[in-house]
Interface confidence: medium
Amino acid sequence: SGTTNTVAAYNLTWKSTNFKTILEWEPKPVNQVYTVQISTKSGDWKSKCFYTTDTECDLTDEIVKDVKQTYLARVFSYPAGNVESTGSAGEPLYENSPEFTPYLETNLGQPTIQSFEQVGTKVNVTVEDERTLVRRNNTFLSLRDVFGKDLIYTLYYWKSSSSGKKTAKTNTNEFLIDVDKGENYCFSVQAVIPSRTVNRKSTDSPVECMGQEKGEFREI
């Protein structure tokens, strides 16, 4: 129950990519505003996005403090212009979010091929180690820093002149593959956390092809 002119938020949804994490909800407010609170299982509630008319709240700063914690958020509804007003139960209406564990659930962002270098019949393909907003000792950690061995990359590569794809995997950010001399190849990579049950794979990176300026070629 609550006041007649406020409605509780619903469809609370976590949207998270590479730990950039936003809580979204409905409805668009009519004569009401929202405040969000976030907590770990054992922690105190912390308020964010005070008295907002938005239907989203960026909670990245809170969840990056420990991406292996499990978080719960709740969205409070207040009458616009009278945020002290409460529901008949003596508190504002609120709705709880699903639990969210960033390490297990954040989506893997689209990776980028940083470079490729051909030396004879070998090509070294390097994936950009994307920076996250997770900090340690005042520095931002990369995706590899955070996930360590849990993160692998899959490389898809094929001759420019054909469509038959080959694959390679690495648990670093580099691939060393064999290619046919004199052939141009195209590459795409995908970030994968094989042991996840949800959000296991990123979208594929943009395709990069030999003969374009990303690469460097040294014939031996």
């Epitope: 420990d66 292996k68 914690q69 499990t70 390490y103 297990l104 061995k149 648990n171 094989p194 042991s195």
Partner: antibody, heavy 118, light 107 residues
């Protein structure tokens, strides 16, 4: 259903080697690190090392690094742990365990008892 | 390597009692702690991961808490089938290390 089935008990003489197998089923074998943990009689758990079944890359506990070798056979979804230069204090139950996302060991084999005795 | 100190090494409690086991890490392990149950002659079973998350199928009477160096494992109402040895393990930094174990018995 995830299952890790280990080879049977072994009795070895000091100085010999033992190779324990762990056959995985019910999941993608190459998607999870396989770990080996041992437990001496009446004692606690001791981590020996882990292997990435996808690449064959291994990490060892420094204590065992000179004597333990971890391998996998992707064609049979089997992980192996070989311990050489056995001594009486290596008498223990040896477990394989699948490492879950983020570190914990979610599935364990039934254990293989290795007895080292002259 | 990170040392894990678990206490007590054994305890005796009555059915229905609240049982608490503590584990102290020699350096911060963030939330990188797991708890296992091992019954005599059986393999260990994962109960808690990331310090406070119950693993699939684990009854709600088992819980974990803590952060950094100090961690607690609780059985809210001890049942006869909970007789076992319980181990903490840090999975924050290799080599992964275990506590010495706590043997739980029924009075």
């Amino acid at each position: 259903e995830v299952q890790l089935v280990q080879s049977g008990a072994e009795v070895k003489k000091p100085g010999a080697s033992v190779k324990v197998s762990c056959k995985a089923s019910g999941y993608s074998f190459t998607g999870y690190y396989m770990n080996w943990v041992r437990q001496a009689p009446g004692q606690g758990l001791e981590w020996m090392g882990e292997i990435n079944p996808s690449t064959g890359g291994s990490t060892y506990n420094q204590k065992f690094k000179a004597r333990v070798t971890l391998t996998v056979d992707q064609s049979t979804n089997t992980a192996y742990m070989e311990l050489s230069s056995l001594r009486s204090e290596d008498t223990a139950v040896y477990y394989c365990a699948r490492r879950e996302l983020g570190g914990p060991f979610g599935y364990w084999g039934q254990g293989t008892t290795v007895t080292v005795s002259s | 390597s990170i040392q894990m100190t678990q206490s007590p090494s054994s305890l005796s409690a009555s059915v229905g009692d609240r049982v608490t086991i503590t584990c102290k890490a020699s350096q911060s392990v963030s939330t990188g702690i797991a708890w296992y149950q091992q019954k005599p002659g059986k393999s260990p079973k994962l109960l808690i991961y990331f310090a406070s998350n119950r693993y699939t199928g684990v009854p709600s009477r088992f819980s974990g808490s803590g952060y950094g160096t100090d961690f607690t494992f609780t059985i809210s109402s001890l049942q006869p089938e909970d007789i076992a040895t319980y181990y903490c393990q840090q999975d924050y930094s290799s080599p992964w290390t275990f506590g010495g174990g706590t043997k739980v018995e029924i009075k």
